[in-house]
Amino acid sequence: EINGSANYEMFIFHNGGVQILCKYPDIVQQFKMQLLKGGQILCDLTKTKGSGNTVSIKSLKFCHSQLSNNSVSFFLYNLDHSHANYYFCNLSIFDPPPFKVTLTGGYLHIYESQLCCQLKF
């Protein structure tokens, strides 16, 4: 398991909400991405492919999420001070092998200016 701080802007604030960006390498084909708040799993997204190369995307802990070819974004709404915490992107790479787990994260600071409005997408 590789641990580290995100070397990119992990938190993107929108009106009253935050987009948490979890990146993965372009070469990764199949994976599980979990968003952890402290040690608790808040959200997850798993992408796999079948024998016909058909993609399956699953969430056991569902959050509003967005998948691109090198990132998963998880969206948290209605921010308040209780959201301030360490957040981690826990990436399990299934394909290509070998199986690998990486953990990157950062601290989400909540300021009054970010609590002004309710986010609508």
Epitope: I27, Q29, Q30, T46, T48, K49, G50, S51, G52, N53, T54, S56, K58, F94, D95, P96, P97
Partner: antibody, heavy 117, light 111 residues
Framework: EVQLVESGGGLVQPGGSLRLSCAAS????????MDWVRQAPGKGLVWVSN????????EYSPFVKGRFTISRDNAKNTLYLQMNSLRAEDTAVYYC??????????WGQGTLVTVSS | DIVMTQSPDSLAVSLGERATINCKSS??????????LTWYQQKPGQPPKLLIF???TRHTGVPDRFSGSGSGTDFTLTISSLQAEDVAVYYC?????????FGPGTKVDIK
Amino acid sequence: EVQLVESGGGLVQPGGSLRLSCAASGFTFSDYWMDWVRQAPGKGLVWVSNIDEDGSITEYSPFVKGRFTISRDNAKNTLYLQMNSLRAEDTAVYYCTRWGRFGFDSWGQGTLVTVSS
Amino acid sequence: DIVMTQSPDSLAVSLGERATINCKSSQSLLSGSFNYLTWYQQKPGQPPKLLIFYASTRHTGVPDRFSGSGSGTDFTLTISSLQAEDVAVYYCHHHYNAPPTFGPGTKVDIK
């Protein structure tokens, strides 16, 4: 150790039905796509069908589409193949296989289906 | 559907000699960095066994005398020094799209 054990094969008349089962153990069944692959006596391998981790995606070979139905019960760690309107050309050993992300990495021993009058 | 062909249909090789099996697909299996091509070995009376995936990566526990090469539409499985236990039928298989298909197989025997 991954184990896949097929059952339910046998002799059936043309137009008849059979339900194959595959009991899986030694891995987290609900984390994997699963497939059926068949092999006619003395012939090569032919893919039949697959199903994703929770059963929401299924795909079929053109040879069996509309006649066969793949399903799974993750609580019982079991894969199924319901075969209807069977034909003589469906006679084969049917293998249950685990799609291990980039290949069929585990196979059962197979169950023989014979369609004959 | 993508059609997979193999050559030769069968070959006999002396123990310790090199065996080469060719596989051709009717369209390219290359997507991004990956060739969606696998090789399987089936010994008499047994189910198949995964040998090589992504055209050239050996599966866990596969001896290094087995190697895969090629890209696009032309692929090769090589057994560098044939052993008695390598007597089997070898199949190539694509998972580029649905339906995945297998080649007809190549039978390898001892000369």
